[in-house]
């Protein structure tokens, strides 16, 4: 069975979060997709969404967020550039499927942004150049406002029994700590 999990990314200010959410290609290829932040005790807030219908491999930029939907592969790429400490939080990808409730994708992203110089060798900050080289479509977030009242917004259980950390030999540059935490089984 698929587990809804969190993956934790610890990055420095100025760096880029570069993640992907996968979806069932046959069902959702052209569906509108969105990137949301989940704050404790609040409804998820949509920060950016793709066009409707979603266009293949067509970057959409909303502020510092760039979404790119690879229809052919069932992948939504999300980049948050020039990260700020206040960007820290829990994020998720969803697929809008009106009139039904949004379909939540795996996995959730727990982003922790800390202050500090990010220009160390191998830092991800150079990735920020990449997102501007093809002028993305800048759109206003014309996204449906409804969100699922059933979305779990409380913190995941603190149990360590179900937590798996990256293998010790893995060197994920500046993604210093990625931890999978099941939200529920």
């Amino acid at each position: 069975a698929t587990k809804l999990t969190e993956e934790k990314y610890e990055l420095k200010e100025g760096q880029t979060l570069d993640v992907k959410c996968d979806y069932t290609l046959e069902k959702f290829a052209s569906s509108q997709k969105a990137w949301q932040i989940i704050r404790d005790g609040e409804m998820p807030k949509t920060l950016a969404c793709t066009e409707r219908p979603s266009k293949n491999s067509h970057p959409v930029q909303v502020g510092r967020i760039i979404l790119e939907d690879y229809h052919d592969h069932g992948l939504l790429r999300v980049r948050m550039v020039n990260l700020q400490v206040e960007d820290s939080g829990l994020y998720q990808c969803v697929i809008y499927q009106p009139p039904k409730e949004p379909h939540m994708l795996f996995d959730r992203i727990r982003l922790v942004v800390t202050k500090g110089f990010s220009g160390t060798p191998g830092s991800n900050e150079n990735s920020t150049q990449n997102v501007y080289k093809i002028p993305p479509t800048t759109t206003k977030a014309l996204c449906p406002l409804y969100t699922s009242p059933r979305t779990v917004t409380q913190a995941p259980p603190k149990s360590t029994a179900d937590v798996s950390t990256p293998d010790s030999e893995i060197n994920l540059t500046n993604v210093t700590d990625i931890i999978r935490v099941p939200v529920f089984n």
Partner: antibody, heavy 123, light 107 residues
């Protein structure tokens, strides 16, 4: 340590299908995408596609889309790649590969490779 | 799709030589580039990721540099065990593509 052990060599006739398995050990199978890369004899490397063992979702390049199926059995930490309607030009070594980062990272660095499975298509 | 062009396609060098291989992308790929080594009959091995980061356990004589469209892979002092084919690979977007490879031989 991380290990990907693939099934043995196969000889198939044109038009047939082949299913290659890839058994993972040494890490949490559902935490990392499995990709498939092939290499025809004396040729370069060709990315075929990916699969997320947690969600079961997968994607493949246009060239293979109608012929490839990527599946998994999480109970035995095994990924499968099935290629149908085989032709002689599909004769190649097929590799399963694990990425450097967790499934959510857009970081397509192929860190751990299986030993490869030679598939020969010949009438 | 992004095309990756490696040069030279083959080269011969002596033990101790400095060896350089280049990889050119058909468009800007920032630093989304990896380098692999493949010895005959073996699976490829990741050496460098994100253009310049050395994978854990890889000898420091291997290095990578570049960004945008032009990248360089260098072996500072060639060793007999470095005989292999080397590939670059981009992941700026989907689909992922590899260079055609550079075959390295000892003189």
């Amino acid at each position: 340590q991380v290990q990907l052990v693939q099934s043995g060599a196969e000889v198939k006739k044109p038009g047939a299908s082949v299913k290659v398995s890839c058994k993972a050990s040494g890490y949490t199978f559902t935490s990392y995408d499995i990709n498939w890369v092939r290499q025809a004899t004396g040729q370069g490397l060709e990315w075929m596609g990916w699969m997320n063992p947690n969600s079961g979702n997968s994607g493949s390049v246009k060239k293979f889309r109608d012929r490839v199926t990527m599946t998994r059995d999480t109970s035995i930490s095994t990924a499968y790649m099935e290629l149908s309607s085989l032709r002689s030009e599909d004769t190649a070594v097929y590799y399963c590969v694990r990425l450097i980062g967790y499934s959510s990272a857009f970081k397509w660095s192929f860190q751990h490779w299986g030993q490869g499975t030679l598939v020969t298509v010949s009438s | 799709d992004i095309q990756m062009t490696q040069s030279p396609s083959s080269l011969s060098a002596s033990v101790g030589d400095r060896v350089t291989i280049t990889c050119q992308a058909s468009r800007d790929i920032s630093k989304y580039l990896n380098w692999y080594q493949q010895k005959p009959g073996k699976a490829p091995k990741l050496l460098i990721y994100d253009a310049s980061n050395l994978e854990t356990g890889v000898p420091s004589r291997f290095s990578g540099s570049g960004s945008g469209t032009d990248f360089t892979f260098t072996i500072s002092s060639l060793q007999p065990e470095d005989i292999a084919t080397y590939y670059c690979q981009h992941y700026d977007n989907i689909p992922i593509t590899f260079g055609q490879g550079t075959r390295l031989e000892i003189k």
